[in-house]
């Protein structure tokens, strides 16, 4: 016999207490797939968290989080302080990225530089807090007497960095 | 030398989920950024994100981040990128790129990977 | 999101042609551009990065000059192997963005 619930289709929910019939989602809840006994309560973006998608009766609100803070978890279930590029966040909060690391993002750890001669080439560009070394030719194919070492590009504005 | 090989040609059912491999050999895996690049019939590159697989630690385009799953295995030295509830416009050439010694510039590209959706 | 301008869409020149490529990004990128050829086979092959650095092993006929937000890619004088589409993307900020490229054929 087939199961009379499989003929409910995503939104409503099989009612038990009105003989299995199909109801529609309450307010503020969902059932994304169909042949659903209830209905799922809607995730509510409060908070540091701000709402990048409403509820719907078939599908979940989905947050991201409000400006300097980030998305941190699967489905953004956590929201993390931005730092300055350059910095990284500790306990403490955003300390500046220590000598020989970068950080070009608003979140994330400071990493260390590229090691160019890992791959037999040269540093064209030094490293600098908020970026990395840019690695250049291998130091055979410098001409002699060729400088290879271009300073860093100028810092660029606190809030020019990615995401 | 420095490669990246990227998995067979795959053919996909809208709703359908697909999972591209990209196999480095040559170096270190964990030292260098893998960057996943789309390129439709007949358009331009886009980026879609990036992985540094000796944390991976993961960035994304927005537009893709619904979209694009990135994943690193060290133990094989190899990067994966699942597609989710494909659908037509998901139809392209998929790239796996390796950066040049800093994340700015990729001079290792994978040899892509054709991805149809098609019902 | 950077948005990268690149011209022409196509051109058309006869071999040992001076040929050049614009490429204009919406806001300042430093020096952080690179170019990429694409061959017809789909192989895609870095050519120049950070502005004007020839990748070792790229003929010096292929160079790369501007900043900020004007860039020029050159090919002094073209080869029937350089049949490709060209592209700029910009490495300075995410997510990191290519131009439409630029489909160069030979008379």
């Known amino acids: 016999l087939q199961d009379p619930c499989s003929n409910c289709p995503a939104g409503t929910f099989c009612d038990n207490n009105r003989n299995q019939i199909c109801s529609p989602c309450p307010p503020n809840s969902f059932s994304s797939a169909g042949g659903q006994r209830t209905c799922d309560i809607c995730r509510q973006c409060k908070g540091v968290f701000r709402t990048r998608k409403e509820c719907s009766s078939t599908s979940n609100a989905e947050c991201d989080c409000t400006p300097g803070f980030h998305c941190l978890g699967a489905g953004c279930s956590m929201c993390e302080q931005d730092c300055k590029q350059g910095q990284e966040l500790t306990k403490k909060g955003c300390k500046d990225c220590c000598f020989g690391t970068f950080n070009d993002q608003k979140r994330g750890i400071c990493r260390p530089w590229t090691n160019c001669s890992l791959d037999g080439k040269s540093v064209l560009v030094n490293g600098t807090k908020e970026r990395d070394v840019v690695c250049g030719p291998s130091p055979a194919d410098l001409s002699p007497g060729a400088s290879s070492v271009t300073p860093p590009a100028p810092a660029r504005e606190p809030g020019h960095s990615p995401q | 030398q420095v490669q990246l090989v990227q998995s067979g040609a795959e053919v996909k059912k809208p709703g359908a989920s697909v999972k591209v491999s990209c196999k480095a050999s040559?170096?270190?895996?964990?030292?260098?950024?893998i960057n996943w690049v789309k390129q439709a019939p007949g358009q331009g590159l886009e980026w879609i994100g990036n992985?540094?697989?000796?944390?991976?630690?993961?960035n994304y385009n927005q537009k893709f981040k619904d979209k694009a799953t990135i994943t690193a295995d060290k133990s094989t030295s190899t990067a994966y990128m699942e597609l989710s509830s494909l659908r037509s416009e998901d139809t392209a050439v998929y790239y796996c790129?390796?950066?040049?010694?800093?994340?700015?510039?990729?001079?290792?590209w994978g040899q892509g990977t054709t991805v149809t959706v098609s019902s | 999101d950077i948005q990268m301008t690149q011209s022409p869409s196509s051109l058309s020149a006869s071999v040992g042609d001076r040929v050049t490529i614009t490429c204009r990004p919406s806001q300042d990128i430093s020096n952080y551009l690179n170019w990429y050829q694409q061959k017809p086979d789909k192989t895609v092959k870095l050519l120049i990065y950070y502005t004007s650095r020839l990748r070792s092993g790229v003929p010096s006929r292929f160079s790369g000059s501007g900043s900020g937000t004007d860039f020029t890619f050159t090919i002094s004088s073209l080869q029937p192997e350089d049949i490709a589409t060209y592209f700029c993307?910009?490495?300075?900020?995410?997510?990191?963005?290519f131009g439409q490229g630029t489909k160069l054929e030979i008379k």
């Open positions: 992985i540094y697989p000796s944390d991976s630690y993961t």
């Open positions: 993307q910009q490495g300075d900020t995410l997510p990191y963005t």
């Open positions: 040559g170096y270190t895996f964990t030292s260098y950024w």
């Open positions: 790129t390796r950066d040049y010694g800093s994340s700015y510039s990729y001079n290792v």
